[in-house]
Amino acid sequence: FKVATPYSLYVCPEGQNVTLTCRLLGPVDKGHDVTFYKTWYRSSRGEVQTCSERRPIRNLTFQDLHLHHGGHQAANTSHDLAQRHGLESASDHHGNFSITMRNLTLLDSGLYCCLVVEIRHHHSEHRVHGAMELQVQTGKDAPSNCVVYPSSSQDSENITAA
């Protein structure tokens, strides 16, 4: 399986909410002995590998923001901790999973990574990740709403987020 990032760049005004999204692609084993561990973190475009370093999002670690379930089951973080920081991660039945960040500030700008670990019990782990950039802007040049830019594999025309 692979992870796709529908949008590689999100440009948002300060104070706005944004939902960053990743999507699981390819065959997904729904066997009872396969589990998916999904999480989010901030990172940097490292020399060795993008998304290798795992930094907190608003002081919450990837351990705090994880989702865990089998196959394409839906799940979301119910952590009061995450919600107190204006964060919520969620996953649906179609392989989409996301993190919503509320009331954006300039400090939220940076590289964000989604990580999916396919746990094949009695065998091994398989990990894949996706990366996207968030730019939070302020002042007269800032957009009125978030503007999202599709990843290069998709249509290059920018789409305004609802």
């Epitope: 002995d33 589990t35 561990y37 060795v48 590998q49 290798s52 795992r54 990837f62 351990q63 994880h66 865990h68 089998g70 990580l115 670990v117 746990i119 019990h121 009695h122 065998h123 091994s124 782990e125 990990r127």
Partner: antibody
Framework: QVQLQESGPGLVKPSETLSLTCTVS????????WSWIRQPPGKGLEWIGH???????NYNPSLKSRVTISVDTSKSQFSLKLSSVTAADTAVYYC???????????WGQGTMVIVSS | EIVLTQSPATLSLSPGERATLSCRAS??????LAWYQQKPGQAPRLLIY???NRATGIPARFSGSGSGTDFTLTISSLEPEDFAVYYC?????????FGGGTKVEIK
Amino acid sequence: QVQLQESGPGLVKPSETLSLTCTVSGGSISSYYWSWIRQPPGKGLEWIGHIYYSGSTNYNPSLKSRVTISVDTSKSQFSLKLSSVTAADTAVYYCARDIPAFAFDIWGQGTMVIVSS
Amino acid sequence: EIVLTQSPATLSLSPGERATLSCRASQSVSYYLAWYQQKPGQAPRLLIYDAFNRATGIPARFSGSGSGTDFTLTISSLEPEDFAVYYCQQRINWPLTFGGGTKVEIK
């Protein structure tokens, strides 16, 4: 802050079963792997096995025939049973949280188990 | 199973010196390798994950490098509290395995 605490007998007779429990406090046991690792006196670390919160287990092949790891999410505990012990099983036994695609990030302080008659 | 071989077994150095510890895997573990520090009477503590990333709260004098089968943990300038035993550990597949350890002792 998540903390782990091992408990169980410090002395076990040869051929008997070693039983240890690890209590998880300050966080949920309903995610991650929960591992047992041991360290014989003056030697290195050996991974015994782990259990996922869902109940799936993986064991070190060298111990598999004698090991059982179980979890009780209602009590936030997971347990180790090692049967037919010998003096070679004398070690400090650690429980640890094992994050998928990461590492053992939180450890108990360890409990010494001596196998002797 | 994957065998991790650490060298040297013992490293005798003085505070302020640079320590270089090696970990070699019997087959490729990609970059899925962690390093731990253990002091007498204590549980191990995570230092480095995924070969080169420092865990939370670990000082910048600790750095990891390598991929595939050869890995290095470097302590740029030894502090008194760094004298301990260091273990590498792979997680590319199960069973999870540790190296035999390198003891860094005061010269």
